[in-house]
């Protein structure tokens, strides 16, 4: 019960996750205009990724996308890349997650099938986590710089002309989102690592006839793992996995414990 | 067509307060700002405040003690409420809609003289 | 609050000649965000409210005949007109709108010999 609410769980906060980083890399705010130098502008000025915008104090806004690639800081392309790469990661790993899940059943689909399909949709989530987190903490290591730099300007000159227009830039709320978005797939991923532990055949699983006081027989896989009969043993709450492929029948002549997660 | 005009009390008493009504057509408030200007005899423009679409209000530092400015956007009405007025308050007060920043239509303007 | 300082304060000109007015603001009125100069210029003719004439530095109000110009980037701003026309006698105002509180220059009076 435990290892589905886990997988459950990790792929809830992943799929939230994820929304996240496409809602961060859509969103237009990622630095915003600081007005600690002008406070009473009637012109706000925020960028994005993909666009910069104006929005003035009559409620009209104005954006413009950044249309050349090559002019376009090399930063800013790596922090493109690293969030498209975690949002690719992420879809990806929620497709795979999805067929993972303990609570679907596709066919005949083993369960060391799922466990190996949740470490991998686990891992991906992991990965896409660190590439958001990673975008977003560039791009916010980039505006830090930045913005010490015009605060120099401001008082010290370009060239020994002092600049009269300095627009500097602060952390939009798209880093945010960002990050806790990062986080939460991020979360998500280790979630389903952990449900893949508990869905995992135990290595140490018996090798030998198990015997019971019960009259049921016990099926023996020679080569495989043991068939649970879901009576008297795995009193240590392990998960135990047939050797072979069970039909439907037998699954309910024979219900084993995993049937009732 | 777009219109505006102000009306007001005309003479207005030291200390006493003025209330000037701008009615607008041709446009709804929900959409446009309305500033408000005004210009002392012989002399240049001084602007006082707007009122945003959102019913959000800017006003001009010196004035903003005294100065309020509100609206009713059913009856497409913006009001000018000036406090403890003095001599140098007589002037000819406008207001104009507000276009992406820019006044695009005036109104004709009252007069408040104020004097005892 | 950004001081606004037009220049001549009164020119008399004769019909048909080119006349320029500057307008200087103590801080930039340029936008990076959109490259705009958030800078207008109005006419007011004798007992008549202001009518706009120039936006954003440059553009021309629609129904403003073409041979009023508008220039100037940052602090520093023009107004041009090509040919003086008899009609143009007025004052000529320039306000900031970028930042409060919107600030008007002291005006230019235009007037014809």
């Known amino acids: 019960m435990a290892v589905t609410a886990c997988q459950g769980l990790g792929f809830v906060v992943s799929l939230i996750g994820i929304a996240g980083i496409i809602a961060a890399t859509c969103m237009d705010q990622w630095s915003t205009q600081d007005l600690y130098n002008n406070p009473v502008t009637a012109v706000f000025n925020y960028q994005g990724l993909w666009r910069s915008c104006v929005r003035e104090s009559s409620g009209f806004t104005e954006c413009r996308g950044y249309f050349t690639l090559l002019g376009l800081p090399a930063m800013l392309q790596a922090v493109r890349a690293l969030m498209i790469v975690g949002i690719v990661l992420g879809a990806i790993g929620l497709l795979v997650s999805i067929f993972a899940l303990k609570c679907i059943r596709i066919g005949s689909m083993e369960d060391s099938a799922k466990a190996n399909m949740t470490l991998t949709s686990g891992i991906m989530f992991i990965v896409s986590g660190l590439c958001a987190i990673a975008g977003v903490s560039v791009f916010a290591n980039m505006l830090v710089t930045n913005f010490w730099m015009s605060t120099a300007n401001m008082y010290t000159g370009m060239g020994g002309m002092v600049q009269t227009v300095q627009t500097r830039y602060t952390f939009g709320a798209a880093l945010f989102v960002g990050w806790v978005a990062g986080g939460l797939t991020l979360i998500g991923g280790v979630m389903m690592c952990i449900a893949c532990r508990g869905l995992a055949p135990e290595e140490t699983n018996y090798k030998a006839v198990s015997y019971h006081a019960s009259g049921h027989s016990v099926a023996y896989k020679p080569g495989g793992f043991k068939a649970s009969t879901g009576f008297g043993s795995n009193t240590k709450n392990k998960k135990i996995y047939d050797g072979g492929a069970r039909t439907e029948d037998e699954v309910q002549s024979y219900p084993s414990k995993h049937d009732y997660v | 067509q777009v219109q505006l005009k102000e009306s007001g009390p005309g003479l207005v008493a030291p200390s006493q307060s003025l209330s000037i009504t701008c009615t607008v057509s041709g446009f709804s408030l929900t959409s446009y700002g309305v500033h408000w200007v005004r210009q002392p005899p012989g002399k240049g423009l001084e602007w006082l405040g707007v009122?945003?679409?959102?019913?959000?209000?800017n006003y001009n530092i010196a004035l903003m003690s005294r100065l309020s400015i509100s609206k009713d956007n059913s009856k497409s009405q913006v009001f000018l409420k000036m406090n403890s007025l003095q001599t140098d308050d007589t002037a000819m007060y406008y207001c104009?809609?507000?276009?992406?920043?820019?006044?695009?239509?005036w109104g004709q303007g009252t007069s408040v003289t104020v004097s005892s | 609050d950004i001081v606004m300082t037009q220049s001549p304060s009164s020119l008399t000109v004769t019909a048909g000649e080119k006349v320029t007015m500057t307008c200087k603001s103590s801080?930039?009125?340029?936008?990076?965000?959109?490259?705009?100069?958030?800078l207008t210029w109005y006419q007011q003719k004798p007992g008549q409210p202001p009518k706009l004439l120039i936006y954003w530095a440059s553009t021309r109000e629609s129904g403003v005949p073409d041979r009023f110009t508008g220039s100037g980037s940052g602090t520093d701003f023009t107004l041009t007109i090509s040919i003086l026309q008899a009609e143009d006698l007025a004052v000529y105002y320039c306000q900031n709108d970028y930042s409060y509180p919107f600030t008007f220059g002291s005006g230019t009076k235009l007037e014809i010999k």
């Open positions: 104009a809609r507000d276009r992406r920043l820019a006044m695009d239509y």
């Open positions: 801080q930039s009125l340029l936008n990076i965000g959109n490259q705009k100069n958030y």
């Open positions: 009122i945003w679409p959102g019913g959000n209000t």
